[in-house]
Amino acid sequence: LTCLGGFASPGPVPPSTALRELIEELVNITQNQKAPLCNGSMVWSINLTAGMYCAALESLINVSGCSAIEKTQRMLSGFCPHKVSAGQFSSLHVRDTKIEVAQFVKDLLLHLKKLFREGQFN
């Protein structure tokens, strides 16, 4: 599930149901955001590469008491093969950069959209 980029001609391959639901949840969060998401909580930025699901979970799991992203946290855990707990960090984190949760979610969504457009949009 973490390898998305190898679309072969002639056409793209749509995502699995689980990945589709993750994208839809990220869309819901970004489109329905009224007040600052998670009270403006900051999380470590990540490198959006092969292990991004675990890295994203490692970053977001440090946000507690934010119901708006609980579903996203659960979904990401389904894409990460190992158990993730708060305070755990991988080399994929950009440890000197913290961003708001809202921006983190938006960046993750944009990256997933780019991955699925690869191989279909020239």
Partner: antibody, heavy 119, light 107 residues
């Protein structure tokens, strides 16, 4: 509310080109792909291609490759579809429609632009 | 290219009757199948997405089912405003394709 407003009807001669515009409002333009679909009189729907406004990347139906160009102007949230070397069988209503990602449904449509190709 | 075949081409029914429209794909498209309604002189309108997911604002009498290659749109009890042409659309792979349409007309 989301709206896609297209340019008005056009009459063209065979061999000419037509450029149809589609102005989007009510949502963040770069968040959605713009797809173009046409419908000849009394016929069904035919997908022509799509553009990702964020990157300018395009995907065209092989049937129209070489004759169609899709572009966007993000400053005005407007998409354009140009069809060249027009033939009489290009007479159709041309629709723009938005899709979050290609596998999503076409949830909002423009009102359509009738292009008539006649000598 | 995924070919979608809709049947019947025309369905003649009376208001209050049940309408069952079929769409068959030339290959497995999972649930990446969407349904649209089109009335004369109007743009198509989305009715059902991902084969069976309903759209807010669309009456509950419209429902979809199916997966893989065989899909069905059901209108449980036809209202006068439901007489129109219905199209299915492949969202699985490029080129995106539409079925030829089913015209639901008043008997």
């Amino acid at each position: 509310q989301v709206q896609l407003v297209q340019s008005g009807a056009d009459v063209k001669k065979p061999g000419a080109s037509v450029k149809v515009s589609c102005k989007a409002s009510g949502y963040t333009f770069i968040d959605y792909e713009i797809h173009w679909v046409r419908q000849a009189p009394g016929q069904g729907l035919e997908w022509m291609g799509a553009i990702d406004p964020e990157t300018g990347g395009t995907a065209y139906n092989q049937k129209f490759k070489g004759r169609v160009t899709m572009t966007t102007d993000t400053s005005t949230s407007t998409a354009y579809m140009e069809l060249r070397s027009l033939r009489s069988d290009d007479t159709a209503v041309y629709y723009c429609t938005r899709i979050l990602l290609y596998y999503y449904p076409m949830d909002y449509w423009g009102q359509g632009t009738l292009v008539t190709v006649s000598s | 290219e995924i070919v979608l075949t809709q049947s019947p081409a025309t369905l003649s029914l009376s208001p209050g009757e049940r309408a069952t429209l079929s769409c068959r794909a030339s290959q497995n498209i999972s649930d990446y199948l969407h349904w649209y309604q089109q009335k004369p002189g109007q743009a198509p309108r989305l009715l059902i997405y991902y084969a069976s997911q309903s759209i807010s604002g669309i009456p509950a009498r419209f429902s979809g089912s199916g997966s893989g290659t065989d899909f069905t749109l059901t209108i449980s009890s036809l209202e006068p405003e439901d007489f129109a042409v219905y199209y299915c659309q492949n969202g699985h792979s490029f080129p995106l394709t539409f079925g030829g349409g089913t015209k639901v007309e008043i008997k």
